[in-house]
């Protein structure tokens, strides 16, 4: 969480941003809130990106003003126009690119004054893993697959029964480049698994951490997955 203050004459307004991550090829949100104003026509929102001379986005007098928008963002940005009046200056970024990573500034001008705050935006690829029993293998084997990751993640296996055990000797992980030549499919195989145990496949890079759990008993198989963005925490 980054809170910025700005001074305009005697007045400053508080602007708050939250670091976040974008999943390339999908839509992302750059979060920014500010002290609201009574009149929408008095609010100006400017989004800037470090090292880029054109604007990322501008909203003023109740509508988008994109004449000064940098071409790398053309057609890809939008604010939540109906929420500006309540202090939401967050930016929706369509079709996130790897090159969208960087430091952004949310700059606000209202009748009360002006203020700004920066946010770090990371880009990469992350997806939920799925763990399955590989019935084609000669021994009891688990297969963990996640379709899209970038940068290349680490994969670690863990077990509820054998806590602290190192499974690197009995697992094999491969990374297969996807058709767009950036993201990769992650496949990790764990051998010699035992029943009545819960195994976890943990995939992590500097943007996200995802875990796929599988509980194998004689009568059933239970699966659970979750994904956590690492850099959207308060800072």
């Amino acid at each position: 969480l980054i809170i910025g203050f700005g001074i305009s004459g005697r007045h400053s307004i508080t602007v708050t941003t939250v670091a976040s991550a974008g999943n390339i090829g999908e839509d992302g949100i750059l979060s920014c809130t500010f002290e609201p104003d009574i009149k929408l026509s008095d609010i100006v929102i400017q989004w800037l990106k470090e090292g880029v001379l054109g604007l990322v986005h501008e909203f003023k007098e109740g509508k988008d003003e994109l004449s000064e928008q940098d071409e790398m963002f053309r057609g890809r940005t939008a604010v939540f126009a109906d929420q500006v009046i309540v202090g939401n200056a967050s930016l929706r970024l369509k079709n996130v690119q790897l090159t969208d990573a960087g430091t952004y500034k949310c700059y606000i001008i209202t009748s009360k004054g002006k203020g700004n705050a920066n946010l770090e935006y990371k880009t990469g690829a992350f997806s939920m893993p799925e763990v399955n029993v590989d019935y084609n293998a000669s021994s009891e084997t688990l297969r963990c697959e996640a379709p899209r990751w970038f940068p290349q993640p680490t994969v670690v296996w863990a077990s509820q029964v054998d806590q602290g055990a190192n499974f690197s000797e009995v697992s094999n992980t491969s990374f297969e480049l996807n058709s767009e030549n950036v993201t990769m499919k992650v496949v990790s195989v764990l051998y010699n698994v035992t029943i009545n145990n819960t195994y976890s496949c943990m995939i992590e890079n500097d943007i996200a951490k995802a875990t796929g759990d599988i509980k194998v008993t004689e009568s059933e198989i239970k699966r659970r997955s979750h994904l956590q963005l690492l850099n959207s925490k308060a800072s």
């Epitope: 470090e50 090292g51 880029v52 001379l53 054109g54 000064e68 090159t99 002006k114 920066n118």
Partner: antibody
Amino acid sequence: EVQLLESGGGLVQPGGSLRLSCAASGFTFNTHAMHWVRQAPGKGLEWVSAISGSGGSTYYADSVKGRFTISRDISKNTLYLQMNSLRAEDTAVYYCARLLGRFGEYGMDVWGQGTTVTVSS
Amino acid sequence: DIQMTQSPSSLSASVGDRVTITCRASRSIYTWLAWYQQKPGKAPKLLIYDASTLQSGVPSRFSGSGSGTDFTLTISSLQPEDFATYYCQQSYSTPYTFGGGTKVEIK
């Protein structure tokens, strides 16, 4: 010490080409947008071109668009201006300058000493 | 393109005088304005950015004000080393544009 040092100026005939270089030192080169600004003899300052920190975006004045190309080599900490189809009105002292801060809204805080380009037959 | 009109184009003043230079943008540039000082044969020097923020190392007798389209550079008490040409420049929109300059001469 933060420094910019231009080179590559000289006398060239109309229609000719020159490549100006600007060696940067004392700061993290790839986090700053960089500019070329020129000043014709006895005249004011004219913005010529700029390049984003990553080098991914370039910007030109209408008077040089299609003839000049700005680029940067981050491994060499050097900014370039390739000038083709030069005209007499391109005669000027050319300065490279660093954009202050991390965003585009501030001025140019570090300037080189300038290199002179003379276009004449 | 945004036009920057500076006035006066030249002025004569004495040491100790209060000097005011104005700059007008053809449309709103908020506070995206810088002021520079240039002496003959030298590169420009940044004095003020963001319309009113004094650049590090610049004497406090220099000040800037304004927003939108009208801006002012003030030298509260002119010193011998301040005789130079002053330029405003907008960085709101590419192409960046400079004012025509104001030459401050000794009366």
